[in-house]
């Protein structure tokens, strides 16, 4: 147990106000009642507490709410949010977008990515899914925060809100997140015409399978190199030289610049050198002429089959 200190009568706290900035750490510990603090949280952010004093206030709230703060307190945390760890936030149940907005504003300019990711996760859990209002709040107050959600949480995104997602909102999304978002985007944009569809689906293509890339190659989409470089390696490898040429259109020349980088490097290694030469880009590293190409996965499957019979 923490060593007990008694509050001097003249220091008793009846309301949360500016006089508290003159309290020493031990005086705050002894004199500030946590329930009063919780009830008057909306006053705290206007008071210029030191970081050490904020630590005491946080410990007071932790003591009062060991299972996590109620939303009435969370909404008014203000700069006290900067003291919260992802473990603290994981205990919260947040449903209000006003609360989310308030805390996203506070976190701006601070290294709070883990905390913000956890907060957004709690909001999605609290609201049951990542609905349009939540997505709109994220795009307005925290571009890129969408990608801080786990693939599991993103799976609750209804296709109807995909249209509100801007390309820059997906910049930090990883392959597993795009794997989840891509099918939703495909569904959301399915009734659009070819060129319009490509503009919309492009930011999500990091989650596209080979078949869809093959289909796009038939539509004269002229994919830019930046988008191509974000495609899944496994989706690119099975594409033929002709298909990549059609997919990239005039941007095919960019393959030379990227020939040492994945997925281009890996794709080159899978192509016949003869086919690569038809591009006239001087790409090297393809399978030499006359070599037999064995699909290793087929060979493995066959040998596995023989072992069991």
């Amino acid at each position: 147990d923490v060593e007990r200190t008694t509050c001097p009568p003249e220091k008793e706290v009846h309301e949360i106000d500016e006089s508290l900035i003159f309290y020493k750490k031990r005086e705050l510990e002894a004199c500030v009642d946590a329930a009063l603090l919780a009830a008057q949280m909306d006053r705290v952010d206007a008071i210029p507490f030191t970081y050490e004093q904020l630590d005491v206030l946080k410990h007071k709230l932790d003591e009062l709410y060991p299972q996590g703060y109620p939303e009435s307190v969370i909404r008014h945390l203000g700069h006290l949010f900067l003291k919260m760890s992802p473990e603290d936030i994981r205990k919260w149940n947040v449903t209000s977008l006003e609360t989310l907005k308030a805390l996203l504003k506070v976190s701006k300019g601070h290294e709070m990515s883990a905390q913000v990711a956890t907060l957004i996760d709690r909001v999605v859990v609290g609201r049951g899914q990542l609905d349009k209002d939540t997505a709109d709040t994220l795009t307005a107050f925290c571009p890129g925060c969408l990608c801080s959600l786990s693939p599991e949480r993103l799976s609750s995104v209804p296709p109807s809100i995909i249209g509100a997602v801007r390309p820059q909102d997906l910049d930090t999304c990883g392959p597993r997140q795009l794997d989840v978002l891509y099918p939703k985007a495909r569904l959301a944009f399915q009734n659009m015409s070819g060129s319009e569809y490509f503009v919309k689906i492009r930011p999500f293509l990091g989650g596209a399978p080979t078949e869809d890339l093959k289909a796009l190659s038939q539509q004269n989409v002229s994919m830019d190199l930046a988008t191509f470089m974000k495609l899944r390696r496994e989706a690119v490898l099975p594409l033929s030289v002709a298909e990549v040429q059609k997919l990239l259109g005039p941007h095919v020349e960019g393959l030379k610049v990227e020939e040492q980088h994945s997925p281009v490097r890996d794709w080159i290694l899978k192509q016949r050198q003869d086919d690569l030469d038809t591009l006239g880009l001087g790409l090297q590293g393809g399978i030499p002429n006359g070599y037999l190409i064995l699909d290793l996965s087929v060979r493995e499957a066959l040998s596995h089959h023989h072992h069991h019979h």
Epitope: A30, A34, A38, P66, P70
Partner: antibody, heavy 119, light 108 residues
Framework: EVQLLESGGGLVQPGGSLRLSCAAS????????MSWVRQAPGKGLEWVSN????????NYADSVKGRFTISRDNNKNTLYLQMNSLRAEDTAVYYC????????????WGQGTLVTVSS | EIVLTQSPGTLSLSPGERATLSCRAS???????LAWYQQKPGQAPRLLIY???SRATGIPDRFSGSGSGTDFTLTISRLEPEDFAVYYC?????????FGQGTKVEIK
């Protein structure tokens, strides 16, 4: 099941002392604010004191300030009320109660222990 | 300190009737910190309502709380024989916690 069991009440002379205990079980005592509330015979309820779980921050009603001391032993899951300089008007049933911060209310109460201050 | 005044002091009603109990505060109380308790003779108080309007675990839905600011109400929609008791309101912020003087609901 939450249980609060008070003990230590009895007859004491004015100016005397008494120490009440409250044994708690069925919940995480180390996470919980605790209170003492009293009720004089035939009268209403009067809050006496509160103590926080970790810092052991204390608060008292003006009527007992300087005479009563609330404390706790988290290792024994026990709450105490040390009552000194007792007066006739302190005669009451003393209840130990758990303060539920999420409800901001006293959600579980013991059955009480009677303290009689009389010469 | 905040003074809570309950009215009426005694309410004489028959089973099946509706009971309306009032609790008035000397200054504004956040509804989050207003509770109601029931106490029967020889027993400890029991929490009925917290946050002015939320029923505590196991409390029948005939009990309801309402109000904000300085005026709060406890309503028992249809009195059952076991509801005849004394009812107290309480505020828990700021200190000191204060209780109303109680309203006794008795059988007419």
């Amino acid at each position: 099941e939450v249980q609060l069991l008070e003990s230590g009440g009895g007859l004491v002379q004015p100016g005397g002392s008494l120490r009440l205990s409250c044994a708690a079980s069925g919940f995480t005592f180390t996470h919980t604010y605790m209170s003492w509330v009293r009720q004089a015979p035939g009268k209403g309820l009067e809050w006496v004191s509160n103590i926080s779980p970790t810092y052991s921050t204390t608060n008292y009603a003006d009527s007992v300030k300087g005479r009563f001391t609330i404390s706790r032993d988290n290792n024994k899951n026990t709450l105490y009320l040390q009552m000194n300089s007792l007066r006739a008007e302190d005669t009451a049933v003393y209840y130990c109660a758990r303060y539920n911060a999420y409800h901001a209310a006293l959600d579980y109460w013991g059955q009480g222990t009677l303290v009689t201050v009389s010469s | 300190e905040i003074v809570l005044t309950q009215s009426p002091g005694t309410l004489s009603l028959s089973p099946g009737e509706r009971a309306t109990l009032s609790c008035r505060a000397s200054q504004s109380v956040s509804s989050s910190y207003l509770a109601w308790y029931q106490q029967k003779p020889g027993q400890a108080p029991r929490l009925l309502i917290y946050g002015a309007s939320s029923r505590a675990t196991g409390i029948p839905d005939r009990f309801s709380g309402s109000g904000s600011g300085t005026d709060f109400t406890l309503t028992i929609s249809r009195l059952e024989p076991e509801d005849f008791a004394v009812y107290y309101c309480q505020q828990t912020v700021p200190y000191p916690y204060t209780f109303g003087q109680g309203t006794k609901v008795e059988i007419k």
